[in-house]
Interface confidence: low
Amino acid sequence: ECGHISVSAPIVHLGDPITASCIIKQNCSHLDPEPQILWRLGAELQPGGRQQRLSDGTQESIITLPHLNHTQAFLSCALNWGNSLQILDQVELRAGYPPAIPHNLSCLMNLTTSSLICQWEPGPETHLPTSFTLKSFKSRGNCQTQGDSILDCVPKDGQSHCSIPRKHLLLYQNMGIWVQAENALGTSMSPQLCLDPMDVVKLEPPMLRTMDPSPEAAPPQAGCLQLSWEPWQPGLHINQKCELRHKPQRGEASWALVGPLPLEALQYELCGLLPATAYTLQIRCIRWPLPGHWSDWSPSLELRTTERAPTHHHHHHHH
């Protein structure tokens, strides 16, 4: 190698200056007794190199690029060799921004997978490889007193969420949780959440069912539907409240909400609907009276209300 580049920093803030030095060893001087060192950023020649012969006979050129406005570029030093440039050395330069503070950190406790799933917004593009780490610790108080730390959770590349498995959680005990973003230009940390994983439990929705008609049961009245559901129960008992929504399948009607509903309903009659109309129904539940998150809406159940009975039959019902 005849030449060697060293730079003030290979990674800088976008728009910041960068200084580079290219040294040509003395044993390469046969190329030219006073070789003129040229600089190139990408494909463009860069003026402004200051060249000097050092006491040991080596040649040095120093250049300052006042603003590195490329997020990635190769800086090379070269000599004129005949009619072409002879590259002596090159370095990759990167420019970008330190990570912004991650924001909107929120967490859900998924009792199906027994894991605490946290997500956040990473902030604007840094143009540099930026790693995110979900950090947490156990606490018996309001997270001002710290207990054992929990192993860092590192999301897969490009993801802004991470799952802390059950084995690292103590349910019914507070945890301090925050996200740390890091790249070559700095580190930032989100505001800390303090939460009991069970207080952010997200339940699975119940399963809605149509009631099997039985010979002894009265048929539903006109404009009514008969249905049933069972609450989802994980391994531990969780009190919950539920709500139902429904809308006609046809037309532009919006959802109508009914609730709170009884926790379990082996038989529930929903009335006040349009007769002879197909309806879509869904149900969801939340831990209650303790804190939690609403479950997703259940898969839809599609049912049709009975037709309005003829007037004399209707009259007959009331006698």
């Epitope: 950090k135 610790f137 054992d148 730390s149 929990i150 301090g176 890091e182 700095g186 580190t187 940390m189």
Partner: antibody, heavy 118, light 107 residues
């Protein structure tokens, strides 16, 4: 009770090497960041280096970069600082410390004196 | 790296005095600021973490405040055992630099 015990300090000539050790007990060592902080005689505290729980992240102060290496052995609950190319200005008491989850130096050892002199 | 500047570098006070020490960061560090006490010949001791949180076992006469770049350690009523040197330290970045220290001496 958290305990941190440094060893390996002593007198060394400029250009020489030394390896400091810190034996930790009283907490789950493998879950915590650890660090080294030094204090030259009559001077203030100077952060030297720290290391993540797994050992994958190892930042250094500019003054020691390229000369010092921090490492840990989680199976032995021990933190190390390998110091090469020592200079007179590296003379200091070197403290081993356990970091809390917000980067605070929660617990400190009593320190070990490193003297670099010819 | 973020640099930490403490002031004053030393102060003289009497038992019972209210003492305030300030620490300034060269750029915003949110609340990631910690305070330590060190007595001669002893290892430092954590007093306050995350700007205002009292470490277990630290007397309540010590308090911390501030956010961003400017932080304060206050000793509400100085006790004989509080004569020591106090340091701030930022933990916003991995390069966790300390302030230069404030020596609290007996007047």
């Amino acid at each position: 009770e958290v305990q941190l015990l440094e060893s390996g300090g002593g007198l060394v000539q400029p250009g020489g090497s030394l390896r400091l050790s810190c034996a930790a007990s009283g907490f789950t060592f493998s879950l915590y960041w650890m660090g080294w902080v030094r204090q030259a005689p009559g001077k203030g505290l100077e952060w030297v280096s720290s290391i993540s729980s797994s050992g994958g992240v190892t930042p250094y102060a500019d003054s020691v970069k390229g000369r010092f290496t921090i490492s840990r052995d989680n199976s032995k609950n021990t933190l190390y600082l390998q110091m090469n190319s020592l200079r007179a200005e590296d003379t200091a008491v070197y403290y081993c410390a356990k970091l809390g989850e917000l980067g605070q130096y929660q617990f400190w050892g009593q320190g070990t004196l490193v003297t670099v002199s010819s | 790296d973020i640099q930490m500047t403490q002031s004053p570098s030393s102060l003289s006070a009497s038992v019972g005095d209210r003492v305030t020490i300030t620490c300034r960061a060269s750029q915003g560090i949110s609340s990631y600021l910690n305070w330590y006490q060190q007595k001669p010949g002893k290892a430092p001791k954590l007093l306050i973490y995350y700007a205002s949180n009292l470490q277990n076992g630290v007397p309540s006469r010590f308090s911390g405040s501030g956010s961003g770049t400017d932080f304060t350690l206050t000793i509400s009523s100085l006790q004989p055992e509080d004569f020591a040197t106090y340091y701030c330290q930022q933990s916003f970045q991995y390069a966790q630099h300390f302030g230069g220290g404030t020596k609290v001496e007996i007047k």
